[in-house]
């Protein structure tokens, strides 16, 4: 054979490629061996042009060998070298993390090295960079920013060689609102575009909940509860569903009664209702809104009503709320059933924004009476909280 | 008690105007619409107007609309009806009522009534 | 303007029988209904609100029942104090409209 190349080197495999014997042959033998490492020997078909050379030792130096058998006979061999990547450091960590300090930590890696390069970088751009000695598997960071998203990375070095980059990220401390129990906490912390986030409810981190937050509309600091805007999600749900929650909090979902139950509970929240169809807008605003627990079956609070899309919720101040197993509205039928939703139904209703998707027939689909009435499904609709103190918070936040 | 007493009514000639009140006691005024209703002599009940509880929101009857205006001071809890141009097809039986939410719905307390005659 | 019929206009009734009274609206209002009681010379009182709630205070012989365009007014049992005449309403849409009432009178 001739040619001998390796290729695809990492820190522990590589592959070897020759070109074939002109003759045929039956097999090529193949050896490698490194400083520290013994010999290894494989045998492989004559039709083979590559074999991959796994569990190798990282930052080795490897002579690679391959001669081929036809028979008793055996051609000359063939030689070549590679080196070994240096293997990454391993369990970056930071720990110990406050509002300007935290302690990284990590494994070293199986090589031997000369040093580590330590890279941290914060969200707004700011670079450092730190050589630490073979030995050390921490370091003190020092002169951080509060409140402030870090990525750090670490690489291993050994003379001119160097590791892959292992990276961990983390958050300095110092945030007005550490666990923050609501979207507007999330807010004045900084956080500034609409997603996912972790709220926690009663400021309690063992009450971690996953909303989505709507830091836009007037203002921003909105808990969504309800979405839709496309007819995926089955809304036509029992009341376990209604009271846990379903759906995917990008998409079209409903965030539980258990949850608005909780959060309307930490203090006095409002209820805005932003409704879009065909181009045209409309919006509702409640300033007084509450959700009751089990034992009221959530039953909801609802005064204070300004906007454009006429006061409907009103009709429902007061009510508990109904799904198709569980009736609990002031008709004779039940409300859940014949309109194929869920809601704070009365006698029926003048919001059925958990109704079906699409549907024009008579109170049947995506309704808000006052604005297109009930013959009329709406395209998109969210329901979303925030505390009604808002303004003022926000106010205080600036001038701090 | 829940009260409602109505005043103003009486003998106007037709073109003219009068001005209908309603005194509310009994009840936080603020948190319930307001109405008024009217019976002609022998005949059946008709809705006239409707205010919200906060007064932003105020509806009228077809057959009264741009002659008629209701208003409320929720300070003094009272409800009025001020009556221009007024028909010989607007004597009737004035009934303030209350409703049941802050909304236009139900009316679940009313007054005794004042006469309103439009007579040349 | 959704336009509510009564029927019928008149019901001469012995004390004791079973009053049925209905009411019909030209248009779908879910349960959007009230029942009221008006005696002569009287302000009209509140009996049933949506199409099937007594009102508190009034006597479990009155009952309502429908959805949508028809809704029925029952007395179970008719009494003396029961001789008035009844409106339907609706409270679906402005304007809030009345039927055209229904006298309840002794046979």
């Known amino acids: 054979p001739s040619g001998l190349v390796t290729a695809n080197i990492t820190d522990s495999e590589a592959l070897a490629r020759w070109q074939p014997a002109i003759a045929t042959v039956d097999s090529y033998v193949i050896s490698y061996t490194g400083e520290k490492v013994p010999e290894i020997t494989r045998t492989v078909s004559g039709n083979t042009v590559e074999y991959a050379l796994t569990d190798l030792e990282p930052a080795t130096e490897y002579t690679l060998r391959i001669f081929a058998e036809k028979g008793p006979q055996k051609s000359s061999t063939i030689t070549a070298k590679f080196t070994t990547d240096l293997d990454s450091p391993r369990d970056l960590t930071a720990t110990e993390v406050q509002s300007e300090t935290a302690l990284l930590t990590w494994r070293p890696p199986r090589a031997s090295v000369t040093g580590y390069l330590l890279v941290y970088e914060s969200v707004d751009g700011t670079v450092k960079e730190v050589i630490v000695g073979p030995d050390t598997t921490s370091y003190s960071l020092a002169d951080l920013s509060p409140s402030t998203h870090y990525t750090a990375k670490i690489q291993a070095l050994n003379g001119p060689l160097r590791s892959n980059m292992i990276q961990t990220i983390f958050t300095t401390i110092g945030l007005l609102y550490p666990f923050p129990k609501d979207c507007s906490q999330a807010m004045l912390n900084g956080d500034t575009t609409s997603g996912l986030y972790t709220i926690y409810l009663n400021g309690d981190k063992a009450e971690a909940l996953e909303v989505f937050c709507d830091m836009t509309s007037d203002g921003g600091g909105w808990i969504v509860f309800l979405r839709r805007k496309n007819g995926r999600e089955n809304f036509y749900q029992n009341w376990k569903a209604y009271a846990a929650g379903f759906g995917d909090r990008r998409e079209e979902f409903w965030l539980g009664l258990d949850n608005l139950n909780k959060i309307t509970a930490q203090g006095q929240y409002e209820l805005r209702v932003d409704l879009r169809d065909h181009g045209e807008t409309a919006f509702a605003v409640y300033d007084k809104f509450s959700v009751g627990d089990a034992k009221t079956r959530y039953k909801l609070k609802v005064e204070g009503y300004s906007g454009t899309a006429g006061d409907s919720m009103a009709y429902h101040n007061g009510r508990s709320f109904s799904t198709f197993d569980k009736d609990t509205d002031s008709a004779i039928t039940n409300c859940a059933l014949s309109y194929k939703g869920a809601f704070w139904y009365r006698n029926c209703h003048r919001v059925n924004l958990m109704g079906r998707y699409g549907d024009n027939n008579h109170s049947q689909g995506v309704n808000w009476f006052h604005w297109k009435g009930h013959e009329h499904s709406i395209q998109f609709a969210e329901m979303k909280l925030r505390p009604s103190n808002f303004r003022n918070l926000e106010g205080r936040r600036k001038r701090a | 008690q829940v009260q409602l007493v109505e005043s103003g009514g009486g003998l106007v000639q037709p073109g003219r105007s009068l001005r209908l009140s309603c005194a509310a006691s009994?009840?936080?005024?603020?948190?319930?619409?307001m109405h008024w209703v009217r019976q002609a002599p022998g005949k059946g009940l008709e809705w006239v107007s409707g205010?919200?509880?906060?007064?932003?929101?105020?509806y009228y009857a077809d057959s009264v609309k741009g002659r008629f205006t209701i208003s409320r001071d929720n300070a003094k809890n009272s409800l009025y009806l001020q009556m221009n141009s007024l028909r010989a097809e607007d004597t009737a039986l004035y009934y303030c009522?209350?409703?049941?939410?802050?909304?236009?719905?139900?009316?679940?307390?009313w007054g005794q009534g004042t006469m309103v005659t439009v007579s040349s | 303007d959704i336009q509510m019929t009564q029927s019928p206009a008149s019901l001469p009734t012995p004390v004791g029988d079973r009053v049925t009274i209905t009411c019909r609206a030209s248009?779908?209002?879910?349960?959007?209904l009230n029942w009221y009681q008006q005696k002569p010379g009287k302000a009209p009182k509140l009996l049933i609100y949506?199409?099937?709630n007594l009102e508190t205070g009034v006597p479990s012989r009155f009952s309502g029942s429908g959805s949508g365009t028809d809704f029925t007014l029952t007395i179970s049992s008719l009494q003396p104090e029961d001789f008035a005449t009844y409106y339907c309403?609706?409270?679906?849409?402005?304007?809030?409209?009345f039927g055209q009432g229904t006298k309840v009178d002794i046979k």
């Open positions: 248009q779908y209002i879910q349960g959007f």
């Open positions: 205010i919200s509880g906060s007064g932003g929101s105020t």
């Open positions: 009994g009840f936080t005024f603020d948190d319930y619409a």
């Open positions: 949506d199409a099937s």
């Open positions: 009522a209350k409703d049941k939410y802050p909304v236009l719905d139900t009316f679940d307390i």
């Open positions: 309403q609706q409270s679906y849409s402005t304007p809030q409209t």
